[in-house]
């Protein structure tokens, strides 16, 4: 949602967290601001304090309940407001009618581990965190491998078009240090975006056996 020079973007992690970023040109630096969440069909409402992340950008997380509790559904609409203190009052700086399942961004995958490693290949698994059971198998993944002498931005993306929480990396170089990351995205939602990348998993391929071709 945009108001003048203000931008207010929020994502639902599909369970019990709405993360918001509000940016505004020329906003008052000393002002206390909050995000208020008012669901249309729930008894609860929630607030979080916006904290600066850059010169003109603030962020906060609305914690709606226990991490794995299903606090919102596809039919919910949540009115989200940015409120800033002026004098003793609050002023509405930005507002949006938020449809949680149209604005999804899951948590980064966790528990990455090497299942099996060889000279030229490595099998890696991971788990998704705090993802709604509503998705069933309707998830996709992207993975990337960092090779020596390259940057993450240069790493080619591997796409897994189904809910597959493992990958077999092929054509690796023996006795070489690599790093691996994965991210997840539900297929649902007009404004849904990729999760953050997972923490990198470092692994090393096995050395080639002496006297054998590589």
């Amino acid at each position: 949602a945009v108001n003048g020079t203000s931008q207010f973007t929020c994502f639902y992690n599909s369970r019990a967290n709405i993360s918001c970023v509000w940016s505004q040109d020329g906003a008052l630096q000393d002002t206390s601001c909050q995000v208020h969440a008012w669901p249309d069909r729930r008894r609860w409402n929630q607030t979080c304090e916006l904290l600066p992340v850059s010169q003109a950008s603030w962020a906060c997380n609305l914690i709606l309940g226990a991490p794995d509790s299903q606090k919102l559904t596809t039919v919910d609409i949540v009115t989200l407001r940015v409120l800033c203190r002026e004098g003793v009052r609050w002023r509405v700086m930005a507002i949006q009618d938020f449809k949680p399942f149209e604005n999804l961004r899951l948590m980064a995958p966790i528990s990455l581990q090497v299942v099996h490693v060889e000279t030229h290949r490595c099998n890696i698994s991971w788990e998704i965190s705090q993802a709604s059971h509503y998705f069933e198998r309707h998830l996709e993944f992207e993975a990337r491998t960092l090779s020596p002498g390259h940057t993450w931005e240069e790493a080619p993306l591997l796409t897994l078009k189904q809910k597959q929480e493992w990958i077999c990396l092929e054509t690796l170089t023996p006795d070489t240090q690599y790093e691996f990351q994965v991210r997840v995205k539900p297929l649902q939602g007009e404004f849904t975006t990729w999760s953050p990348w997972s923490q990198p998993l470092a692994f090393r391929t096995k050395p080639a056996a002496l006297g054998k071709d590589t």
């Epitope: 108001n3 003048g4 020079t5 203000s6 505004q24 020329g26 906003a27 008052l28 409120l83 002026e86 004098g87 003793v88 009052r89 609050w90 002023r91 509405v92 700086m93 930005a94």
Partner: antibody
Framework: EVQLVQSGAEVKKPGASVKVSCKAS????????ISWVRQATGQGLEWMGE????????YYNEMFKGRVTMTRDTSISTAYMELSSLRSEDTAVYYC??????????????WGQGTTVTVSS | DVVMTQSPLSLPVTLGQPASISCRSS???????????LEWFQQRPGQSPRLLIY???NRFSGVPDRFSGSGSGTDFTLKISRVEAEDVGVYYC?????????FGGGTKVEIK
């Protein structure tokens, strides 16, 4: 029906203090802000500041800082405005007015009837 | 502080005729949230001020539709389409965009 009833007229000597009360009814006192506005005889309106009865937080117009104190007593739904070190220029009608805690639309919707304060030696 | 300047100071009008009051702010009063908190108050003789218009052009509840507000940036207008006897009094513009909030000096509407 929303009502703000203010205390009666006061006559004060220069250098003295005056305390005006504003009793609210017809709404939840702690859900709204009380603003104070004054009007010197034959003059325009001047916003003095306000108090949020919910947590007693105040904000004063710089012009009155150091001389004005706004308080409230939630048990009797009453807001107070005290002005000290009075001078003849403070002779005015003092109004309290209700305002929404979240300034979405307007600053003040309902007003008290006003309290005349005369500063004279 | 934002200075609000009203004109004219006095406005003699004929019953049933239109009336127009101007209000000019010393700086732009568009708030950083993109709203303009320009309000108009009416003060009848011997009475407290009463809210007529908020956010430039929105009529407060119970305000007759002969009252209308317009304008943007620094220039605003209150119009009364057909003045009635009960409209006599002083009209004040008010800005709530920049603290301290400030009023105009007032325009006295009287019947010719």
């Amino acid at each position: 029906e929303v009502q703000l009833v203010q205390s009666g007229a006061e006559v004060k000597k220069p250098g003295a203090s005056v305390k005006v009360s504003c009793k609210a009814s017809g709404y939840t006192f702690t859900d709204y802000v009380i603003s104070w506005v004054r009007q010197a005889t034959g003059q325009g309106l001047e916003w003095m500041g306000e108090i949020y009865p919910g947590d007693a937080q105040t904000y004063y117009n710089e012009m009155f800082k150091g001389r004005v104190t706004m308080t409230r007593d939630t048990s009797i739904s009453t807001a107070y405005m005290e002005l000290s070190s009075l001078r003849s220029e403070d002779t005015a009608v003092y109004y309290c007015a209700r305002g929404s805690y979240t300034y979405d639309n307007y600053a003040m919707d309902f007003w008290g009837q006003g309290t005349t304060v005369t500063v004279s030696s | 502080d934002v200075v609000m300047t009203q004109s004219p100071l006095s406005l003699p009008v004929t019953l049933g005729q239109p009336a127009s009051i101007s209000c000019r702010s010393s700086q732009n009063i568009v708030h950083s949230n993109a709203n303009t908190y320009l309000e108009w108050f009416q003060q009848r003789p011997g009475q407290s001020p009463r809210l007529l218009i908020y956010k430039v052009s929105n009529r407060f509840s119970g305000v007759p539709d002969r009252f209308s507000g317009s304008g943007s940036g620094t220039d605003f207008t209150l119009k009364i389409s057909r003045v009635e006897a009960e409209d006599v009094g002083v009209y004040y513009c008010f800005q709530g965009s920049h603290i301290p909030w400030t009023f105009g000096g007032g325009t006295k509407v009287e019947i010719k």
